[in-house]
């Protein structure tokens, strides 16, 4: 049944689409932008815990003018998926639940077998999304390559296909700052630099807080990241503008440690007003 | 090390040359922005290595407005905006590294204290 007059099942399974996607919601995916070559997707790793791989498989006659030549039922139709070390299988979704295949992976989630029907009938067309965990992607990962192979016990020669994406490591860091207070006032009399003994002699105090947030996974390889603050210490003629008293980094050094920033502030060695800290 | 600005004795101040004098007495309503990115101020860059963190790191910087400079240079100005900028940089051999929205601008407004009497 479903094998034409010659009773030989000559299927025509085709993987007509294999493209990487961003997961928007549980069953909604958006294709990644393409590289200039038009065949490689661009994946920015910015805290996305998963990437989707959209797969569309058809079993249609190769020549609509000769529909009996092939496109017969594909018995024990399967899609075999080989994942790189950087990706791990986490699930499968389909917009239409009736198109969701049964996908089972090996223990380390590097190899997946999806059952596409027994048989996958003549004229069938299914679209589904493999959900792949990106937790294995490191800063050294430059490319994702997933090898895909359709299989059937029906008569058909099948060859592996690769889906590729170029990886950009988009560090999921954001920065925000605030000044306390946001308005300052000056008054009094002019005093020379040498007359300054304590920071209170200098002028109105101001505190800046700059927060760096990491919205993604823990960044293990941030040994070469720096938080920089451009501090306007003088006006164009070289006179003091904002005098830096103290610079302290909290949270970038490991538990409970205060970070050292360079250069050191308070180069005039003015007395610190402890009430201001 | 951070070099201190050129020091002058209290009584030895030179008259400013017009090339950088911020305002004339006829421009008492002027608003000025002091920003290193625009060349209207000079900056020292404090750089803090982020060795490792999971969620957030906070940089605290305490400073003082140099009162005398403002009295000398900007007492006739309506308002000044002083800009502090901060960013994250990553030094890496990795070519495919990208940082988006990794900078911020922190403005502070500075005014002559309305209660003050400035000694000419």
């Amino acid at each position: 049944q479903g094998c034409g007059e010659d009773k030989i099942c000559q299927s025509n399974l085709q993987l007509v689409r294999a493209r990487f996607c961003t997961r928007v919601s549980d069953t909604e995916f958006q294709p990644l932008p393409m590289d200039v070559d038009g065949t490689t997707a661009l994946f920015a790793l910015s805290g996305q815990p998963v990437i989707g791989l959209e797969l569309m498989v058809t079993n249609l006659p190769s020549d609509p003018a000769q529909p009996q030549a092939d496109g017969d039922d594909a018995h024990e139709a399967q899609l075999l998926v080989m994942l790189p070390d950087s990706l791990h299988y986490s699930g499968v979704r389909a917009l239409d639940p009736a198109e969701k295949p049964l996908c089972l992976s090996n223990e380390n989630a590097s190899h997946v077998e999806c059952e596409l029907g027994n048989p996958m009938k003549r004229g069938a067309q299914v679209t589904f999304y493999l959900i792949l965990s990106t937790s294995g992607i490191s800063i050294e990962t430059t490319e994702l390559e997933v090898e895909l192979l359709l299989a059937t016990i029906s008569e058909q020669e099948l060859h592996p296909v690769s889906a590729r994406a170029r990886v950009f490591i988009e560090l999921p860091l954001s920065i925000a700052g605030m000044a306390i207070p946001q308005q300052l006032f000056f008054s009094g009399v002019v005093r020379g630099e040498r007359a300054m003994q304590s920071e209170r002699d200098v002028g109105s105090k101001v505190k800046y807080e700059v927060t760096v947030s990491n919205q993604g996974q823990s960044l293990r390889t941030l040994g070469s990241a720096f938080l920089n603050i451009m501090w306007p210490h003088e006006i164009a003629n070289g006179k003091w503008l904002l005098y830096p008293m103290q610079v302290e980094l909290e949270g970038g050094q490991g538990p409970g440690q205060k970070g050292l920033c360079s250069p050191r502030p308070n180069i005039l060695h003015l007395d610190v007003d402890s009430r201001d800290r | 090390e951070l070099e201190p600005p050129e020091q002058q004795e209290p009584g030895e101040r030179q008259e400013p040359s017009m090339s950088w004098w911020p305002v004339s007495s006829a421009e008492k309503k002027k608003n000025i922005t002091l920003d290193c990115a625009r060349g209207t101020a000079n900056c020292v860059v404090f750089s803090c290595p982020l060795y490792s963190f999971d969620r957030a790191a906070v940089l605290h910087v305490w400073g003082r407005l140099w009162n005398s400079t403002f009295l000398e240079e900007y007492s006739a100005v309506k308002s000044l905006e002083v800009i502090v900028r901060a960013n994250i940089t990553v030094k890496s051999s990795i070519k495919n590294l990208m940082l988006r929205d990794a900078s911020t601008v922190i403005p502070v407004m500075v005014y002559l204290d309305p209660m003050a009497v400035v000694a000419e």
């Epitope: 986490s90 699930g91 009736a98 295949p101 049964l102 029907g117 299914v126 | -």
Partner: antibody, heavy 121, light 112 residues
């Protein structure tokens, strides 16, 4: 023999929650969706939703979206249905039922014996 | 949601006589994959429902051949060629083409 064995009857107060279990045996638990259907006394059947034990995807009837939670424990081949904010209209027999994949066996071929949940103050 | 309407509500039948139950859906039950997901269940008194017919006309395993299903699109029929005493219970039609899956109100078959 393929079997679905459900937990025993429950009496609950309005506003509380109930969690019904369904232990599967005799087949590969992750190869079939698990559905939940309820039947109020003397009434018809109402589909609550289904869960895919292989990756815990759930599809719920919109009517139950805010109150029903479907979960599975693959290690014990057990499916669970929790219904919160119970009201008297939730008094019913709750069934788990096995369903197939990929538009094949897209029906309930094996049913549990049912769990009577009575909601009464 | 798809509304499944069954008729009659009650069906008294003499043993050995044929019986027919109708099920009408508010929308076509032909899925875009070509399958029609219309099924019939029987719930015997005090028991859980059991599958009788799946996808319009396929008998579930162990179901006697006196049960048959037919129909297409939105109109479907369950026929029992010769009713036996053990066939009493409530018959439900059900659709799984559209989410949520829905059931008919049921037809109670009783022996005269």
């Amino acid at each position: 023999e393929v079997q679905l064995v459900q937990s025993g009857a429950e009496v609950k107060k309005p506003g509380s929650s109930v969690k019904v279990s369904c232990k599967a045996s005799g087949y590969s638990f992750t190869r079939y969706w698990m559905h939940w259907v309820r039947q109020a006394p003397g009434q018809g059947l109402e589909w609550i939703g289904k869960i895919d034990p292989s990756d815990s995807e759930t599809r719920l009837n919109q009517e139950f979206r805010d109150r029903a939670t479907l979960t599975v424990d693959k290690s014990t081949s057990t499916a669970y249905m929790e219904l919160s904010s119970l009201r008297s209209e939730d008094t019913a027999v709750y069934y788990c039922a096995r369903g197939g994949y990929f538009g094949e066996q897209w029906y309930h071929d094996v049913w549990g014996q049912g769990t009577l949940v009575t909601v009464s103050s | 949601d798809i509304v499944m309407t069954q008729s009659p509500l009650s069906l008294p039948v003499t043993p050995g006589e044929p019986a027919s139950i109708s099920c009408r859906s508010s929308q076509s039950l032909v899925h875009r994959n070509g399958n029609t997901y219309l099924h019939w269940y029987l719930q015997k008194p005090g028991q859980s429902p059991q599958l009788l017919i799946y996808e319009v006309s396929n008998r579930a395993s162990g179901v006697p051949d006196r049960f048959s299903g037919s129909g297409s699109g939105t109109d479907f029929t369950l026929k029992i060629s010769r009713v036996e005493a053990e066939d009493v219970g409530v018959y439900f039609c059900s659709q799984s083409t559209h989410v949520p899956w829905t059931f008919g109100g049921g037809t109670k078959l009783e022996i005269k």
